[in-house]
């Protein structure tokens, strides 16, 4: 099944996804979307990178880690219950049917009455499986339905890079990465 990640209402959610560029600066396009990974692209695209930069964002979605080193983990700011569901990370490796795609399930819990750390993130021990599982996730209840239009929001790439990325570094060090080249 999809690897499950949890966050509380009002917190930032973190969905990990990594690859290892074949050479420094030799990036691969990546897209993130709401909904399970379809045959092409990322369903309802919320963020994407190209061979050089992050070139499309939508409100509340950003890359916290160093995407130039292959950390394309998604952060969703200030989540609500509506953010629950399946997300698709697609690493668009050039060639004939080479894409790597991962379905990640985000579960949003109501905020606790007691104060909670503002950057709390809850990961399952199954995280490395996300990066070794190929193909499509199994049946589950979340559906795409009619996909809404997306509004662009300008987000500073520099600000994204300056954000705290220690957790992403820890995850990368676990060796759960896709190697390209």
């Amino acid at each position: 099944s999809e690897v499950e990640y949890r966050a509380e209402v009002g917190q930032n959610a973190y969905l990990p996804c990594f690859y290892t560029p074949a050479a420094p600066g030799n990036l691969v396009p990546v897209c993130w979307g709401k909904g399970a990974c379809p045959v092409f692209e990322c369903g309802n695209v919320v963020l994407r990178t190209d061979e050089r930069d992050v070139n499309y964002w939508t409100s509340r979605y950003w890359l916290n880690g160093d995407f130039r080193k292959g950390d394309v983990s998604l952060t969703i700011e200030n989540v609500t219950l509506a953010d629950s569901g399946i997300y698709c990370c697609r690493i668009q490796i050039p060639g004939i049917m080479n894409d790597e795609k991962f379905n990640l399930k985000l579960v949003i819990k109501p905020a606790k009455v007691t104060p909670a750390p503002t950057r709390q993130r809850d990961f399952t021990a199954a995280f490395p499986r996300m990066l070794t599982t190929r193909g499509h996730g199994p049946a589950e209840t979340q559906t795409l339905g009619s996909l809404p239009d997306i509004n662009l929001t300008q987000i500073s790439t520099l600000a994204n890079e300056l954000r705290d990325s220690r957790l992403a570094n820890d995850l990368r060090d676990s060796g759960a990465t896709i190697r390209i080249g």
């Epitope: 897209c31 979307g33 909904g35 399970a36 379809p38 045959v39 092409f40 692209e41 990322c42 369903g43 309802n44 695209v45 499309y56 668009q92 490796i93 050039p94 060639g95 004939i96 049917m97 080479n98 894409d99 499509h136 199994p138 049946a139 589950e140 979340q142 559906t143 795409l144 339905g145 009619s146 996909l147 239009d149 997306i150």
Partner: antibody
């Protein structure tokens, strides 16, 4: 107005080659995945191949990928299908179709050309 | 491969009838399903995408529903121009696959 116009079909002998073209207009060609879909006489629809925005990624029906090659020229707003080692069972009307766009969302072949007939026969 | 099975294969109906065509996927395809209408000698025309969103210019008598593995296309009141062949198609797994078609004929 979105328009897709196929050309290049015709009669070819088994083992021969053919190159189909599709001229696109009325939309930003480089913002969309493109596809070829075929239909044998009196039969249903069969997907053949897809290509991403810049041509760097391609997708094929497994049984065709060793003989068919999809490509595109965004400067010319054109899509191509190179067909080699043609067989009688490749006889069909070949349609060019516009697929999903750069921001995802709409998963269906929204626009189709009129089709071009390929007949493989000796 | 994901198999798409349509039923019925053919259907006779009269103008004004309500008609439902079903499509079943062999695996979960979420809502990545499209419906097309094709008339003899013509290219297919997109009716519905993402299982339930009506394509631009399609009359509101057409509607799609379903998710996962079971989907339906409904025509609420058949018009003379609706007699055609209808196909479902999934956009979830590779290869993309179509149903075998449902031929809608005049009774």
């Amino acid at each position: 107005e979105v328009k897709l116009v196929e050309s290049g079909g015709g009669l070819v002998q088994p083992g021969g080659s053919l190159r189909l073209s599709c001229a696109a207009s009325g939309f930003t060609f480089s913002d969309y995945y493109m596809a070829w879909v075929r239909q044998a006489p009196g039969k249903g629809l069969e997907w053949v191949a897809n290509i991403n925005y810049d041509g760097s990624s391609t997708y094929y029906l497994d049984s065709l990928k060793s003989r068919f090659t999809i490509s595109r020229d965004n400067a010319k707003n054109s899509l191509y299908l190179q067909m080699n080692s043609l067989k009688a069972e490749d006889t069909a009307v070949y349609y060019c179709a516009r697929d999903v766009g750069y921001y995802g969302g709409n998963y269906g072949f929204a626009y189709w050309g009129q089709g071009t007939l390929v007949t493989v026969s000796s | 491969d994901i198999q798409m099975t349509q039923s019925p294969s053919s259907l006779s109906a009269s103008v004004g009838d309500r008609v439902t065509i079903t499509c079943r996927a062999s695996d979960n395809i979420y809502s990545y399903l499209a419906w097309y209408q094709q008339k003899p000698g013509k290219a297919p025309k997109l009716l519905v995408y993402n299982a339930k969103t009506l394509a631009e210019g399609v009359p509101s008598r057409f509607s799609g529903s379903g998710s996962g593995t079971d989907f339906t296309l409904t025509i609420s009141s058949l018009q003379p121009e609706d007699f055609a062949t209808y196909y479902c198609q999934q956009h979830y797994g590779s290869p993309l696959t179509f149903g075998q078609g449902t031929k809608l004929e005049i009774k």
